[in-house]
């Protein structure tokens, strides 16, 4: 019988090393030869390489080897296979060979923590004396702490030009040991080297360092009293695993200090019930090894006029980052926090703050937001302890099309003319935001047309139809991301009108 | 930085044989190609064969007639050409030279500084 | 095997001038082809490869041009330190070849 087809191709270039070509040879039942046909040079050459093993494992690989390796290249290879009964040929397998570039681990030889710097150990490496010189590398650095079985990983990349091997590992748990192990790959490249071998480091010991602290004010109550809801969180650059025993609040009057009340919770948010007048809020988090410095906002008193400074304000999409700007009239504002949270009926229980200064942009990764959900954000100005008048829009991460189309209804039918009406979808099928909708209609057996309408309009006029016509109409709500259709709806013209 | 270091001036007898050495070295001596050209006095440029350090897999101009055989020592980072039997026209600057750029096979980047071969009776 | 043939053999010029050397190939070897520099007593230095495809280090006056079997080195501005030897080799395969050199002369 004939030899069974070569199947699952596989070619990986050990860089400067070998070209291996491996595959699945099938169940063989005699001797069975392999020979490896490849063109390369871009196509401008080609050879063949053949199989000399006896051990049939063996035989289901064939390496090619310098000086007739070249990157980048673009290879064809196809395997046949021969024995005594005949010749049968694999499909055609394709491969960029920058690709397919597989290099040795770099080599690891310092992990220390960088003196005055806390949290933070800077890894120091050899990359591998045989990678590509036309190619930057990619690098994925696993890091654990001792006693822990689970790795951690961060990706980056280094460019070919620079000389600078190292990489700062931050938001590490403070006076912990950790391993690390480096791996890489050219940078188009979907082969990784092994990990080098593991190498320990240490971090410095210290306390909590820092809070940021926001607040969501509520509307008085009857009692003139007003719920503020504290949150507070790390600040930034803290260490990811930094541990806090608890923290301690205390809070008084703008106008006397002597009122002061104090608390301590291990929570991360707290409801206070503050009177009418402006009050200070402090608070620190502390450890076994000390306490945070002090976090200290300003509560405005509920008749407090807050300023106003943001003029406009959009959001975009750019490189999987959801991007929203603004512009503000006061020029002494570089300080602005940033509420997000979904747009759901139900009261947010999601909400979400940053705080950005010297900029009038911010940017979250797409990847943080859910998608084809809307989100409302929020921008406050922040000067000194004033907090001014937010500015809020709408936005989506990434869009979708709607997951269903508008409700749609026939009105006002004529001898030549209709009305077609629908509804605005619902927000929690919308998937983005409504840029236009689109109706469509045909004559039974006619060509069909359509007409485009902006996404304030929900209604719209069909004029010039052909009397006692049976019609099929239906319209799409589109975002940015594609339309979806409504149900289609069928109606007839009339055969005359009461004017005529 | 990338070095290849040549053994000395050899003067040969005709029908003898030179073995003239290239020590590489600020490199992995594995993952690059050796070729060896040659150069007679006032001439022009001769290549002569090459080797893959890595699998010792050779190639050789046909010209030399089974006369050159490239070796190379992976525990000393050196490569060998031994050409026989000798005739005065084997007289030339014989010149180790390392392949270079992923993306120009057959092209001699790095060269030694030559080593002067005479066959003179 | 491929034959390469390099004209002229030699030239004259002066600093400032816009030199040309041609390498023509026995057979079609796509862009398979280097330039090299050779002063005298010294190795040569690879100048070009793939036809085009300047080595690291090389001045920009230097430029290869050609596919197929017509190739040109050329210098733009000919420079003090340009006076030497020019060699075409191709690389499209084994056995190597290098064509007859150019001596590229003071005027």
């Known amino acids: 019988a004939l030899p069974a087809k070569p199947e699952n191709i596989s070619c990986v270039y050990y860089y400067r090393k070998n070209l291996t070509c491996t595959w699945s040879p099938g169940k063989e039942t005699s001797y069975t030869q392999y020979t490896v046909k490849r063109t390369y040079a871009f196509g401008e050459k080609h050879d063949n390489c053949t199989t000399n093993s006896s051990t049939s494992e063996n035989r289901a690989s064939c390496s090619f080897f310098l000086p007739r390796i070249t990157i980048p290249d673009n290879y064809t290879i196809e395997v046949e296979a021969e024995n005594g009964d005949g010749v049968i040929k694999s499909h055609m397998t394709y491969w960029r060979l920058e690709n397919i570039a597989k290099t040795e681990p770099p080599k690891i030889f310092r992990v220390k923590p960088v003196l005055g710097i806390k949290r933070m150990i800077q890894i120091e490496w050899i990359k591998p004396e045989l990678a590509p010189v036309s190619s930057d590398l990619k690098y994925t650095l696993r890091f654990r702490t001792v006693n822990s079985t689970s790795w951690m990983e961060v990706n980056f990349a280094k460019n070919r030009k620079d000389k600078n091997q190292t990489y700062n590992l931050t938001g590490l748990q403070p006076f912990t040991e950790y391993v690390i192990a480096l791996r890489c790959a050219v940078k188009e490249s979907k082969f990784w080297s092994d990990w080098s071998q593991e190498k320990m480091g240490m971090t410095e010991e210290e306390a909590p360092c820092g809070l940021e602290l926001w607040r969501v004010l509520k509307p008085a109550e009857a009692d003139g009293r007003r719920p503020v809801r504290l949150l507070w969180k790390k600040a930034r650059g803290a260490p990811v695993l930094e541990k806090t025993l608890g923290y301690n609040i205390w809070y008084y009057p703008e106008s006397n200090t002597n009122l002061t009340e104090t608390m301590n919770t291990t929570n991360q948010q707290l409801e206070l019930h503050l009177g009418g007048e402006s009050f200070w809020v402090s608070m620190i988090s502390y450890n076994s090894l000390g306490k945070s410095p002090v976090a200290t906002l300003r509560i405005p008193a509920i008749q407090e006029k807050s300023f106003q400074c943001i003029e406009v304000m959009q959001a975009c999409v750019a490189e999987d980052q959801l991007v929203v700007k603004w512009q503000s009239s006061a020029l002494d504002v570089n300080t602005w926090m940033i509420e997000w949270f979904p747009d759901v009926d139900s009261e947010p229980t999601t909400l979400s703050w940053e705080s950005v200064s010297q900029a009038t942009n911010w940017t979250i990764q797409q990847d943080k937001l859910k998608p084809f959900w809307c989100y409302n954000i929020s921008v406050y100005p922040m000067l000194h302890d004033k907090v001014g008048e937010p500015y809020s829009i709408q936005a989506y991460a990434k869009e979708g099309v709607p997951s269903e189309g508008p409700e749609t209804k026939v009105e006002n039918i004529g001898v030549k003319t209709v009305t077609i009406t629908w509804k605005e979808i619902p927000k929690s099928e919308r998937k983005g935001i409504i840029c236009n909708y689109t109706i469509f209609y045909q004559a039974e057996g006619g060509k069909g047309f359509s007409k485009t309408v902006n996404s304030s309009i929900l209604q719209y006029g069909l004029e010039s139809l052909k009397r006692k016509t049976s019609y099929i109409v239906q319209v799409m709500a589109s975002t940015s991301a594609g339309g979806t259709n409504g149900t289609s709806i069928n109606f007839k013209t009339l055969s005359f009108s009461v004017f005529e | 930085q990338v070095q290849l270091v040549q053994s000395g001036a050899e003067v040969k007898k005709p029908g003898a044989s030179v073995k003239v050495s290239c020590k590489a070295s600020?490199?992995?001596?594995?993952?690059?190609?050796m070729n060896w050209v040659r150069q007679a006095p006032g001439q022009g440029l001769e290549w002569m064969g090459l080797?893959?350090?890595?699998?010792?897999?050779?190639d050789y101009n046909p010209q030399f007639q089974g006369r050159v055989t490239i070796t190379a020592d992976e525990s000393t980072s050196t490569a060998y050409m031994e050409l026989s039997s000798l005739r005065s026209e084997d007289t030339a600057v014989y010149y180790c030279?390392?392949?270079?750029?992923?993306?120009?096979?057959?092209?001699?980047?790095?060269w030694g500084q030559g080593t002067l071969v005479t066959v003179s009776s | 095997d491929i034959q390469m043939t390099q004209s002229p053999s030699s030239l004259s010029a002066s600093v400032g001038d816009r030199v040309t050397i041609t390498c023509q190939a026995s057979?079609?070897?796509?862009?398979?082809v280097a330039w090299y520099q050779q002063k005298p007593g010294k190795a040569p230095k690879l100048l070009i490869y793939?036809?085009?495809t300047e080595a690291q280090g090389v001045p920009s006056r230097f430029s290869g041009s050609g596919s197929g079997t017509d190739f040109t080195l050329t210098i733009s501005s000919l420079q003090p330190e340009d006076f030497a030897t020019y060699y075409c080799?191709?690389?499209?395969?084994?056995?190597?070849?290098f064509g007859g050199g150019t001596k590229v002369e003071i005027k």
């Open positions: 080797i893959n350090p890595y699998n010792g897999g050779t």
């Open positions: 030279a390392r392949d270079g750029y992923d993306d120009g096979p057959y092209t001699l980047e790095t």
């Open positions: 600020g490199y992995t001596f594995t993952g690059y190609i």
């Open positions: 080799q191709h690389h499209y395969d084994s056995p190597l070849t």
């Open positions: 793939n036809a085009q």
């Open positions: 057979e079609d070897i796509y862009s398979f």
